[in-house]
Interface confidence: medium
């Protein structure tokens, strides 16, 4: 029995152009959390047994709000270790999957929305009881720095935590703090005492008095970051002047692995370790299955009978996206009519209607004309939450109470003269024109270009508009 422990040191934009400024979407603040998944062996696990060694979820990190114009920072992280207990022997070889998740905290009814920001996969050999192993991985435009170790718990000891150390009732012949182990009758196991001052976080020892540094650290006590040491971890030909290695291009520069795959150098080439759901030389081919639990927010996963076939997420109401990871903005469809205000309550839509309208979608026009009369034979027309009068000819104004001059707008064309009449207006047309508004020219031979004058009316005679 024992515990696998993962410590996230930093998560932030990777180096180079195009790095994201913020993990949050435009909708507002967010916070991060991490999920770790362990699988035994170095080969890809079958779809039916994900996280067979165990999985753990971190606490939520502090709320992050993007600061405009500020440099993109390392993001605030959850406190503490991620711990994955294991009951049986530690396998020694394992696959480690670390997922970085974003929880959006904008004004979202029905709770925050989650989305996967980054996923890294490492296949590793690791003995239990050893020092912290440190790693830096890129996932797309993001960079994750972390350390991990496996340690035995209770009375288990050894690189696989399989040997039991049973305290004996008889006093031990070993010194204080040393554990007598049953299989080793007169021997004791104890961690060696490292050189005084050796960094607890970045150094370790296998022999008493030594101080060996984890990757990324240097100096006699492992307190100097490697980036400040001029000769640490560089590739390429040796420089005659400094004796240091001069950097040269490596096959993993620029990270050729897509979809969050991590790159390892091989002689003259590279190898991509792909996260679950992706495969191919550069992790460019997707193969996520339902056994990975890819559908969020209560979604249902449907795949073929073949475990390696593609999947489809059936999303519950209010969610969309290939993984049901997006909250539907149902108000974007503008379901409220007549200028109503749309409110998405998560479980339902609500329309707040303007005055004069009602109904679930503000589709009902209330009777704006009730109790309102239009004078002088005008008729009331509903619309826009207020009444409007369509007035009889010769009247105008909101309630048709004002007498209107039908000739004020000069309705008679081509010099025709306008006469007010009890039922409207009459145009007396100038010679050569005819029509109710004198709009039609008359041909010189007396034949009109458009409808002939009705019987009893000659072109040029006044015509009453009926």
């Amino acid at each position: 029995a024992g515990v696998f422990e993962l410590q996230i040191h930093s998560f932030g934009p990777g180096p180079g152009p195009g790095a994201p400024r913020s993990p949050c979407s435009a909708r507002g603040p967010c916070r991060l959390f991490f999920r770790v998944c362990l699988k035994p062996g170095l080969s890809e696990e079958a779809a039916e047994s994900p996280c067979a060694l165990g999985a753990a979820l971190s606490a939520r990190g502090p709320v992050y709000t993007e600061q405009p114009e500020a440099p993109a920072p390392d993001l605030p992280l959850p406190n503490g270790l991620l711990q994955v207990p294991f009951r049986d022997a530690w396998p020694g070889t394992f696959s480690l999957i670390i997922e970085t998740w974003r929880e959006e905290l904008g004004d979202q009814i029905g709770g925050p929305a989650w989305s996967l920001l980054a996923r890294v996969t490492r296949r590793r050999r690791l003995a239990a009881g050893g020092p912290w192993a440190r790693d830096i991985q890129r996932a797309g435009a993001w960079e994750l720095r972390f350390s991990y170790r496996a340690r035995c718990e209770l009375l288990a000891v050894g690189t696989a935590c399989t040997r039991l150390c049973r305290p004996r009732s008889a006093p031990s012949r070993c010194g204080p703090g040393l554990r007598p182990c049953a299989p080793l009758e007169d021997e004791c196991e104890a961690p060696p005492v490292c050189r005084a001052g050796c960094s607890l976080e970045h150094g370790f020892c296998e022999q008493p008095g030594e101080c060996r540094c984890l990757e990324g650290w240097t100096g006699p006590l492992c307190t100097v970051p490697a980036s400040t040491s001029s000769c640490l971890g560089l590739r390429g030909p040796s420089s005659a002047t400094t004796g240091c290695l001069v950097p040269g291009p490596g096959p993993c520069d620029g990270n050729p692995c897509a979809n969050g795959g991590s790159c390892s150098e091989t002689p003259g080439s590279f190898e991509c370790t792909c996260p679950r759901g992706f495969y191919g030389l550069r992790c460019e081919v997707s193969g996520v299955t339902c056994a990975d639990g890819p559908c969020f927010n209560g979604g249902l996963c449907v795949g073929g009978a073949d475990p390696d076939s593609a999947y489809i997420c059936h999303c519950p109401p209010g969610f969309q996206g290939s993984n049901c990871e997006k909250r539907v903005d149902r108000c974007s469809l503008q379901p409220c009519r007549n200028g109503g205000l749309c409110l998405d309550l998560g479980h339902a839509l609500r329309c707040r209607c303007r005055a004069g309208f009602a109904g679930p979608r503000c589709e009902h026009n209330l009777d704006d004309c009730a109790g309102r009369a239009c004078a002088n034979g005008g008729t009331c027309v509903e619309g826009g939450g207020a009444h409007r009068c369509s007035c009889a000819l010769g009247f105008g104004g909101r309630d048709c109470r004002e007498r209107a001059d039908p000739c004020a707008a000069r309705p008679c064309a081509h010099g025709g003269r306008c006469y007010a009449h009890f039922s409207g207006l009459v145009c007396a047309c100038a010679p050569g024109y005819m029509g109710s508004r004198c709009e039609f020219p008359v041909h010189p031979d007396g034949v009109s270009a458009l409808p002939a004058a009705p019987p009893g009316l000659r072109p040029g005679d006044p015509q009453r508009y009926l």
């Epitope: 067979a52 165990g54 056994a291 639990g293 209560g298 979604g299 249902l300 073929g304």
Partner: nanobody
């Protein structure tokens, strides 16, 4: 249309047994976490047991450990809840639910909460009298 159909509820004396069944389609059955919940009058709906039919260990709430057993029949796309040594406090409406989880997450108390599940059966009533 997602379909989860429960059956097997009924009335029984304390100490007796019942077996509930939840049948669904082959695709939903094989690809999702299947869980049993129960809701007693005036109480919250609580997770009782869960299983990922494609593999993985089952999960049981502390209140039913040792008395209830969740099992499956792959040929019938059905998940069962065998309820033995029933107590009056087991009286409730029992619901079958399904959702996408990884196998590991299906077997956790934090995973088997009502808010995580969007697809439910219509429920079957279990009444235990003393």
């Amino acid at each position: 249309q997602v379909r989860l159909v429960e059956s097997g509820g009924g009335s029984v004396q304390a100490g007796g047994s019942l077996r509930l069944s939840c049948e669904t389609s082959r695709y939903i059955y094989g690809n999702n976490c299947m869980a049993w919940f129960r809701q007693a009058p005036g109480k919250e709906r609580e997770g009782v047991a869960s299983i990922y039919p494609a593999g993985g260990r089952p999960y049981y709430a502390d209140s039913v450990k040792g008395r209830f057993t969740i099992s499956q029949d792959n040929a019938k796309n059905t998940v069962y809840l065998q309820m033995d040594s029933l107590k009056p406090e087991d009286t409730a409406m029992y619901y079958c639910a399904a959702r996408s989880f990884s196998i590991a997450d299906c077997a956790t108390q934090s995973g088997i909460t009502r808010s995580n599940f969007a697809y439910w059966g219509q429920g079957t009533q279990v009444t235990v009298s003393s």
